[in-house]
Amino acid sequence: LRLLDHRALVCSQPGLNCTVKNSTCLDDSWIHPRNLTPSSPKDLQIQLHFAHTQQGDLFPVAHIEWTLQTDASILYLEGAELSVLQLNTNERLCVRFEFLSKLRHHHRRWRFTFSHFVVDPDQEYEVTVHHLPKPIPDGDPNHQSKNFLVPDCEHARMKVTTPCMSSGSLWDPNITVETLEAHQLRVSFTLWNESTHYQILLTSFPHMENHSCFEHMHHIPAPRPEEFHQRSNVTLTLRNLKGCCRHQVQIQPFFSSCLNDCLRHSATVSCPEMPDTPEPIPDYMPLW
């Protein structure tokens, strides 16, 4: 988790002097509770936005927006703590809006936004906005949270972001798999424009089951430049196991930008359709 570019972050708006500070996620008001605390944020909204760094890279960011309730507690509102928790790693990043002037009611509802938390493809985050000072131990909570799921690199808008392109999102191998005679599979896919090796991972399963009955790995050496964007054809020999008929073919590239952590593409071959009622085999041959 990180912030997009550490350039001056702004939270001031007409009628309010405000500065954005790094935060330890442990506001002082936890340790030294105050008697009077503000109410919770209203209408917390999160959207996925895209922002360019100063270097021109494009990153997905969480756009966080909320409004204030129209009650007198805004007189005691000193700022807000924004927290983003990545759920699969438990990593947390916080910033603090510090109000340098007192808020006053005005003709429209106060609204705040922040769009600098960089998020990763296919990750889930808990986004929390805490009004400051935080409540006394038994006080009503004055925060709002939402669990936000970021689309993966298959998503059309995500595909062109720097983290997705680095993991090979622009490569479309257009995999085709056909079953040949004599227990063989013919796998065909389009090579990318990089001299790097690939790996084909074959996993076979029985018709209706999910535990594998056959696994095989096939190495494809790095193509020469004249082979870039050409089709690569590979014939894989299967184990002659009755009923081991559903095959998943996965192609793993090893691009220089992602090494052994590149996006993999897969295709599946289903078992051949079984007739509902098999034709009975006669145990005698009629003579007429």
Epitope: Q45, I46, Q47, L48, P151, D152
Partner: nanobody, 126 residues
Framework: QVQLVESGGGLVQPGRSLRLSCAAS????????MHWVRQGPGKGLEWVSG????????DYADSVKGRFTISRDNAKNSLYLQMNSLRPEDTALYYC???????????????????WGQGTLVTVSS
């Protein structure tokens, strides 16, 4: 322009099933999370279920969990709600709604629903 058209509602007996459909047009359907929201007679709007852009993540309101199944077919620009074991309290006008922003939030919308269908009426009564 964006259009969401629901269908499949009707009168059904308690314990029976119904399948709602929502046909979407005028936007890139597979970019956005989609939701079902209902409004019972004399009640407010209640979020029912949501599904992420590719169908990979799904969430339900506690009141319908285990009975309703949301799904989508991006090739057909369609959203579905399979409703089983229907109860009288499921009687409502069911709306299909589009998430305004990209991304998906559990327990409802991340931001707001910027487009709604006209609704399809489901009546559960014996």
């Amino acid at each position: 322009q964006v259009q969401l058209v629901e269908s499949g509602g009707g009168l059904v007996q308690p314990g029976r099933s119904l399948r709602l459909s929502c046909a979407a047009s005028g936007f890139t359907f597979d970019d956005y999370a989609m939701h079902w929201v209902r409004q019972g007679p004399g009640k407010g709007l209640e979020w029912v279920s949501g599904i992420s852009w590719n169908g990979g993540t799904i969430d339900y309101a506690d009141s319908v969990k285990g009975r309703f199944t949301i799904s989508r077919d991006n090739a057909k620009n369609s959203l579905y709600l399979q409703m089983n074991s229907l109860r009288p309290e499921d009687t409502a006008l069911y709306y299909c709604a589009k998430e305004e922003g990209l991304g998906f939030c559990r327990g409802g919308s991340c931001s707001t629903f910027d487009y709604w269908g006209q609704g399809t009426l489901v009546t559960v009564s014996s």
